[in-house]
Interface confidence: low
Amino acid sequence: QPVESFPLDFTAVEGNMDSFMAQVKSLAQSLYPCSAQQLNEDLRLHLLLNTSVTCNDGSPAGYYLKESRGSRRWLLFLEGGWYCFNRENCDSRYDTMRRLMSSRDWPRTRTGTGILSSQPEENPYWWNANMVFIPYCSSDVWSGASSKSEKNEYAFMGALIIQEVVRELLGRGLSGAKVLLLAGSSAGGTGVLLNVDRVAEQLEKLGYPAIQVRGLADSGWFLDNKQYRHTDCVDTITCAPTEAIRRGIRYWNGVVPERCRRQFQEGEEWNCFFGYKVYPTLRCPVFVVQWLFDEAQLTVDNVHLTGQPVQEGLRLYIQNLGRELRHTLKDVPASFAPACLSHEIIIRSHWTDVQVKGTSLPRALHCWDRSLHDSHKASKTPLKGCPVHLVDSCPWPHCNPSCPTVRDQFTGQEMNVAQFLMHMGFDMQTVAQPQGLEPSELLGMLSNGS
């Protein structure tokens, strides 16, 4: 006999969220001894029943699920992890990163972190939701629609994996959902932009038009800008993003959103992988999270920051990147873009720490929920005291004091931000302020090597 549950809609809670959360926590703790089941943070692996929908190597794709029976919210998270776009670099990926191409060694459980956590302290936004983590094993930015065959050494079925996961989840409670949030980081973030409308369409066709489908794209809003130093398209990392995607689409039999595809000529579908081009064509509301100085963007632009002195040209290039990115988010009403040098955020445990203009990401997402209320369209007038368009305006990396620690891309060592920015040629006043130093002090310290 199933226990009757009373779903609470936390988006309606206004006023003092901290006080409310404290009450909920206290209630939960007082009820906990009555509960027979242990609170389990883990998401459990389910390989797809339809074994024809596979990872690159033909092993079945799958998803990790943690149900929350009292909730009508479903969070489907698409994992990231670059891509491969020809036989050679896919072979190399299979040798070095097999987990991203095969389900054979996936663990039976995963712990939900960040936005996938069921702890209100770690996830004040959607801790009560049904959590789904979809591992990335198609290497195609979630766009592929081709199976393994004699001709094709690898399957690329990213777009089909999402469709199949949704189909299977309908039998596990998704059919009763009020909101489905398709989220993802890095390649998964781009995957959100490529698939969110298709998921909405799929649910409509299957007879679930009342489920509101929304997107949350983290660190997947890339620019097809000019590289700092042009290199030939040899491997995944040095290949210019436009060229890598152009080649990839053909190799993966990649599919892009229909409305975007219609805007470009045949052979030009690669344009739809770039957020600022695909976003205006999307019907579903999408919240964009993007570091202004994204490490993956810098990597494909052949910028490698090691703390070594930087030429004036590179400093200007980096500042210009932040400016360009800020410009592309100008007309994105729901966005969160801190001026930090980093990559990915939403499934980090400390995703609540970063703020833009005094607002954290979970708070901004809560405001976004409120602004959408029961309609599919974003309200044009922002709610008072509840901002959803949060883009840093200060112009250099790490000028936001809540940025995560800067780490050397190669050694992983924490870098002294003041020195790092000095090497990049930023003016002393600019560098000193967020470090809590006077320019003269900073100059003295750096020049005497202390």
Epitope: D353, Q355, V356, K357, G358, D392, S393, C394, C399, N400, P401, S402, C403, T405, Q413, E414, N416, A418, Q419, A432, Q433, P434, Q435, G436, L437, E438, E441, L442, M445, L446, S450
Partner: antibody, heavy 119, light 111 residues
Framework: EVQLVESGGDLVKPGGSLKLSCAAS????????MHWLRQAPEKGLEWVAY????????SYANTMKGRFTISRDNAKKTLSLQMTSLRSEDTAIYYC????????????WGTGTTVTVSS | DIVLTQSPASLVVSLGQRATISCRAS??????????MHWYQQKPGQPPKLLIY???NLESGVPARFSGSGSGTDFTLNIHPVEEGDATTYYC?????????FGSGTKLEIK
Amino acid sequence: EVQLVESGGDLVKPGGSLKLSCAASGFTFSDYGMHWLRQAPEKGLEWVAYISSGSTTLSYANTMKGRFTISRDNAKKTLSLQMTSLRSEDTAIYYCARKNYNGGYFDVWGTGTTVTVSS
Amino acid sequence: DIVLTQSPASLVVSLGQRATISCRASKSVSESGYSYMHWYQQKPGQPPKLLIYLASNLESGVPARFSGSGSGTDFTLNIHPVEEGDATTYYCQHSRVLPPTFGSGTKLEIK
């Protein structure tokens, strides 16, 4: 549990020297800038010195420059403050504190060690 | 150095009422939309404890009765409703530039 424990406080004569230590545990010490602060009896809080995570940046309060030296050993997770030419006005409880790198505030404090400078 | 003037020096508030403490900086401690002002509570014989950071952010584990506001040079710490255990000393601190400085403290008494 995140913890800072100071030691080395003592009674010392004016002009004398003393070395304070601070042992860190429960967090990645090498990730954080560290400060020494002090509080004279029945007085307010006063900042003493700062050292960045990799010891690349050192800074001192004006009245302590040249007399105090801050240092750290990341492998041993210890912070030190070498004090020389001590004066009676240096009498205080000395605290080590962790600098949160998201804005320069002190999010973890030690319990303090007492330094008394008197003849 | 930036001087922080805290007021009042002492404050008597009834149990359950609101306590308001002010901190004024001699120069702006805000930059690029962020205010580098923080608040601490210090009980006798104990080290200070962080309550509020970057003007308005509640430190983890601190009750929601504490709140901070302000920008530029004027900042406020509010405690509402005041409880018995809140009777102690409160300090503001800035980290806009080195040296970080503290206010002279406000002693809160509960009646």
